[in-house]
Interface confidence: low
């Protein structure tokens, strides 16, 4: 049997393999050692018994999408059945005082791979260590502590495989410099020691994406905006645009990045070298925001040719973005069409190629409450004998839209611990002036928060107020 027969997934076309060579990986045309690593078909009853106490789940994650030329990292974590864990020696043990289907477990081994009787298995240079090999019969590497590594991980993608010894987690990075843009599948099979052989305990696969566009995500935030996720913002207040470039391998660290903004409001093109930018819309309406990110990255040098025209000065236009049937969390980018980037061996010349990333959003600008302030605080005269509570009248003003609701939160002097919260609908005059009466339970210093809200906005102001004791000569003090 060959690796491709064992590891499954649809066969990878030969003409694609030559463009997608992964350094340090081997062709899945290689022979698989079926004696050392028995192959079980789907539905084979032995899968059920391949792990004591249940099934092991392999969870595969990656930091996809990856820009062509950057590194992409895959991490596999093994999730053991309930109450099982890996100890410091790589053995699998039951957690103390953990209840599973068998009742309470004591601290007994599930698999004690590194203890006593097995030690002979690990000796070098004898026929006894012939089984310390990967499925392609290559011997295991033997760095310090390698005996604690009880699992063999076989990663398989693009018609190639990579073998790795590990504990309950394994990590592999690949460089994408020669890879074709588009979605690919990584599949991982995990084996455990079983006497002098290795049996499969889990298989997992995941999609990853190689892209020739810079993966770009933009966060938009604005003071007083009530809902940051609805892409509705307020007129006459700056919106902070922050560009996040998904570059977990820091491929772009040494590249100068330029950001070209068109806010769709006829204010023209803004070019910046900074990933954050403020912009204020002065009209209500719906606007199409467009961002183009550009950078030059190390790339292949074009073959010398007298007839080669100069590269175009304008970037390629972004592809129309189809609505994904399931939108992916975090910054994501579907490929632009699966173009093959045929990168020959990069010569010593320092050539660079331009890469672009695009972000588009439709944002709605509405009127909102821009500002709220406390104009006046007055003590409400009380009849004698005076009750324990003090009443205060606050005169509050706002700018912008008319609020529909006012909330008052009375807290401790640090403004951290709320003691009382009251919200009520408000009727304000055209000048946005309202009077709010609140009771204070005894003397002392209080933090008073006022928030005025409507559908789109929420504006806040705070003040510290000192309520005097009942001595008629002690004055009311407000500390803004």
């Amino acid at each position: 049997k060959r690796f491709r027969d064992v590891l499954g997934h649809e066969q990878y076309p030969d003409h694609m393999r030559e463009h997608n060579q992964l350094r340090g990986w081997s062709s899945d045309e290689n022979e698989w050692d079926e004696h050392l690593y028995p192959v079980w078909r789907r539905g084979d009853g032995r899968w059920k018994d391949s792990w004591e106490g249940g099934r092991v789940q392999a969870v595969l994650t990656s930091d996809s999408p990856a820009l062509v030329g950057s590194n992409i990292t895959f991490v596999v974590n093994l999730v053991f059945p309930r109450c099982q864990k890996e100890d410091a020696n790589g053995n699998i043990v039951y957690e103390k005082n953990c209840r599973n289907d068998l009742g309470l477990t004591s601290d007994l081994h599930v698999y004690n791979w590194t203890a006593g009787a097995d030690d002979g298995d690990w000796e070098d240079g004898t026929s006894r260590s012939q089984h310390l090999r990967f499925p392609d019969r290559r011997p295991f590497p033997r760095p310090h502590g390698w005996k604690k590594w009880s699992f063999v991980y076989v990663f398989h993608t693009l018609g190639q495989y990579f073998q790795k010894l590990g504990r309950c987690s394994a990590r592999v990075s690949i460089n994408t410099v020669n890879l074709t843009a588009g979605p690919q599948v990584m599949e991982v099979t995990v084996f455990r020691r079983y006497g002098r052989a290795y049996i499969p305990i889990s298989k997992v696969k995941d999609v990853y994406v190689i892209t020739d566009q810079i993966p770009v995500f933009v966060t938009m935030s604005q003071k007083n905006d009530r809902n940051l996720s609805d892409e509705i913002f307020l007129r006459d207040l700056p919106i902070v645009f922050d560009v996040l470039i998904h570059d977990p391998s820091h491929f772009l660290n040494d590249s100068a990045i330029s950001y070209k903004w068109n806010f769709g409001d006829n204010t023209g093109l803004f070019v910046s070298n900074n990933h954050t930018l403020n912009h204020t819309y002065v009209l209500n309406g719906t606007f199409n925001l467009n961002l183009t990110v550009q950078t030059a990255v190390p790339g292949p040098c074009p073959p010398p040719s007298p007839s080669t025209p100069p590269p175009p000065s304008t970037p390629p236009s972004p592809p129309p973005s189809p609505l994904p049937t399931l939108s992916t969390p975090s910054p994501s980018l579907m490929p632009t069409g699966y173009k093959s980037m045929e990168l020959s061996d990069i010569s010593n010349e320092n050539c660079r190629i331009n890469r672009y990333g695009y972000f588009r959003a439709t944002i709605t600008i509405v009127e909102g409450i821009l500002e709220v302030s406390i104009m006046q605080i007055a003590d409400v005269p009380m009849p004698t004998p005076q009750p324990a509570n003090s009443l205060m009248d606050f005169t509050v003003t706002c700018k912008g839209a008319t609020p529909m609701e006012a909330c008052t939160i009375i807290s401790d002097p640090t403004c951290q611990i709320a003691q009382n919260r009251v919200c009520s609908p408000v009727a304000v005059d055209g000048l946005c002036l309202l009077s709010v009466r609140r009771a204070f339970n005894g003397s002392g210093t209080y933090c008073v928060n006022f928030t005025l809200g409507d559908d789109a906005s929420l504006a806040l102001t705070s003040t510290l107020i000192s309520i005097p004791g009942k001595d008629p000569d002690s004055p009311l003090r407000a500390v803004n």
Partner: antibody
Framework: QLQLQQSGTEVVKPGASVKIPCKAS????????MNWVKQRPGKGLEWIGQ????????NDNGKFEGKATLTVDKSSNTAYIQLSSLTSEDSAVYFC?????????????WGQGTSVTVSS | SIVMTQTPKFLLVSAGDRVTITCKAS??????VAWFQQKPGQSPELLIY???NRYTGVPDRFTASGYGTDFTFTISAVQAEDLAVYFC?????????FGGGTRLEIK
């Protein structure tokens, strides 16, 4: 447009078997997991298992071992669930639902369900 | 298998009310939780995936959050058409399991 078409109702005798189809259209059938979910009348949802048409890989709920077999026919873009040795406990609505490879449990499109009644 | 304990089982609310449903996993499921809505006589529909991501076309009154073992699902202002049963589901660990469901009824 995207559709998962299931047969309407199946009435079968105790001890018999039934094979329920789910015909997919409007998307790349081989690139999504196909899940099967059981719902007894007035009850919750129970995940039976999933199959990846690209290579026939399956991921099963051990509770249904020996009861449910998942298969696909890529030429007709159809997934099947075969239920065997039927009893009254198997009377339920069976839904097929697809999920993307990278979010294999997030079932974003569902068939309308096939009602199976086991009755003598 | 992982048990998803969903509360409450039943909610009777008025249009415009805010509703919160919680789901507790018997062990950590990272953020691999989905929320489904099933209207009477219909198939379930995906509302939320990966704990907090709203699926395409789902109104923004539906939100969710959580990580590990504790998850919440909120409808900020219930509308008449939200009458349905709501299910949480973990898809971190096979077999994938659903909560028992919350039946939402409108006064």
């Amino acid at each position: 447009q995207l559709q998962l078409q299931q047969s309407g109702t199946e009435v079968v005798k105790p001890g018999a078997s039934v094979k329920i189809p789910c015909k997919a259209s409007g998307y790349a059938f081989s690139s999504y997991w196909m899940n099967w979910v059981k719902q007894r009348p007035g009850k919750g949802l129970e995940w039976i298992g999933q199959i990846y048409p690209g290579d026939g890989d399956t991921n099963d709920n051990g509770k249904f071992e020996g009861k449910a077999t998942l298969t696909v026919d890529k030429s007709s873009n159809t997934a099947y669930i075969q239920l065997s040795s039927l009893t009254s406990e198997d009377s339920a609505v069976y839904f097929c639902a697809r999920s993307p490879l990278h979010l294999r449990g997030s079932m974003d499109y569902w068939g309308q369900g096939t009602s199976v009644t086991v009755s003598s | 298998s992982i048990v998803m304990t969903q509360t409450p089982k039943f909610l009777l609310v008025s249009a415009g009310d805010r509703v919160t449903i919680t789901c507790k996993a018997s062990q950590s499921v990272s953020n691999d939780v989905a929320w489904f809505q099933q209207k009477p006589g219909q198939s379930p529909e995906l509302l939320i995936y990966s704990a907090s991501n709203r699926y395409t076309g789902v109104p923004d009154r539906f939100t969710a959050s959580g990580y590990g073992t504790d998850f919440t699902f909120t409808i900020s202002a219930v509308q008449a058409e939200d009458l349905a049963v709501y299910f949480c589901q973990q898809n971190y660990y096979s077999p994938f399991t659903f909560g028992g469901g919350t039946r939402l009824e409108i006064k």
